[in-house]
């Protein structure tokens, strides 16, 4: 079948999800495409525990996550509700800053060097993290 019961080679398993950490940089949209090409998505952070796990693996490097407001409100790429969900913005962020001189504001979220989040220009070539969930079918205990 098409069930994914274990993580692919070079992916890291954690709490029934698989994570892949890039070592090169891409614009947010290209990173998003490369995650989707793997039947995955840019990482969606749903808890402090997941935040610490990702932060441990990426180190103090700007890294894209699956959160953006390119169409207005902030949205997670997998549909997780932003308003009620986990957040870890830096103080006074997001600020949709226009002063960078690159045109437009800042519509894509990334982990900063201390792990907290910032919004930035989506074209910046940052590293990225892909996430895919192990299939729910494989998480259920066997029927007795």
């Amino acid at each position: 079948g098409s069930e994914r019961t274990c993580c692919p080679v070079n992916w890291v398993e954690h709490e029934r999800s698989c994570y892949w950490f890039s070592r090169s940089g891409k614009a947010w949209a290209d990173a998003d495409n490369y995650c989707r090409l793997e039947d995955a998505h840019l990482v969606v952070v749903t808890s402090w525990e997941e935040q610490k796990f990702v932060q441990h693996h990426i180190g103090p490097v700007n890294t894209w996550m699956g959160l953006h407001d390119q169409n207005g409100p902030w949205k997670w790429v997998d549909g997780t509700d932003y308003e009620t969900g986990f957040k870890n913005w830096r103080p006074e962020q997001p600020d949709d800053w226009y002063g960078h001189g690159l045109g437009g504001g800042e519509d894509c979220a990334h982990f900063t060097d201390d792990g907290r989040w910032n919004d930035d220009v989506c074209q910046r070539p940052y590293r990225w993290v892909c996430e895919t969930e192990l299939d729910k079918a494989s998480q259920e205990p066997p029927l007795l």
Epitope: S2, D30, N33, Y34, R36, E38, D39
Partner: antibody, heavy 121, light 107 residues
Amino acid sequence: EVQLLESGGGLVQPGGSLRLSCAASGFTFSSYAMSWVRQAPGKGLEWVSAISGRGSSTFYADSVKGRFTISRDNSKNTLYLQMNSLRAEDTAVFYCAKDHGIVGTIYFDYWGQGTLVTVSS
Amino acid sequence: EIVMTQSPATLSVSPGERATLSCRASQSVSSDLAWYQLKPGQAPRLLIYDASARATGIPARFSGSGSGTEFTLTISSLQSEDFAFYYCQQYYNWPLTFGGGTKVEIK
């Protein structure tokens, strides 16, 4: 040995439809993204479309978006390209290509020999 | 979209000589570049990926170099089977784009 065999090409009138198939063997088909790449007569290569290994995500060149649909049947180890509203400029040899499989890249380590699509009245 | 420009369009070389093919990107593609060989009626063949890594089974006479916007494919000593079309492809950015190709012909 990896093999990719395209079929389904032929002559079709402008506005018509055609479905290309690519039968794959020699590798775990569902583990690899696949693409269609074309070459118009006397022209260079043009990437047309890609699909993820399990088929959850698809990608298209602007020139075919809304007209072409890529799909796959992993139980049959087969890749498809449904082409609608065909135009004269779609005339080309269409190649099926296997992604190398390195995350964060997409280049093609195996290709088929191609199938010719001719759009003409 | 990143535009890939290959030069020359045609390269006339004698067997045993060196061939140097150029590929230029309209903006930086880092090292996200592949080279392919095409012969009429045959399946295209991957030669080089990541700008300089030789694909499995590719002879050592093929080498790739460059990064950013300027790339080179070198065939150190042309064999009869090397006369063909050569294309570069960038995968730094979507959509994926190819160069217009270089034809290597017998001088």
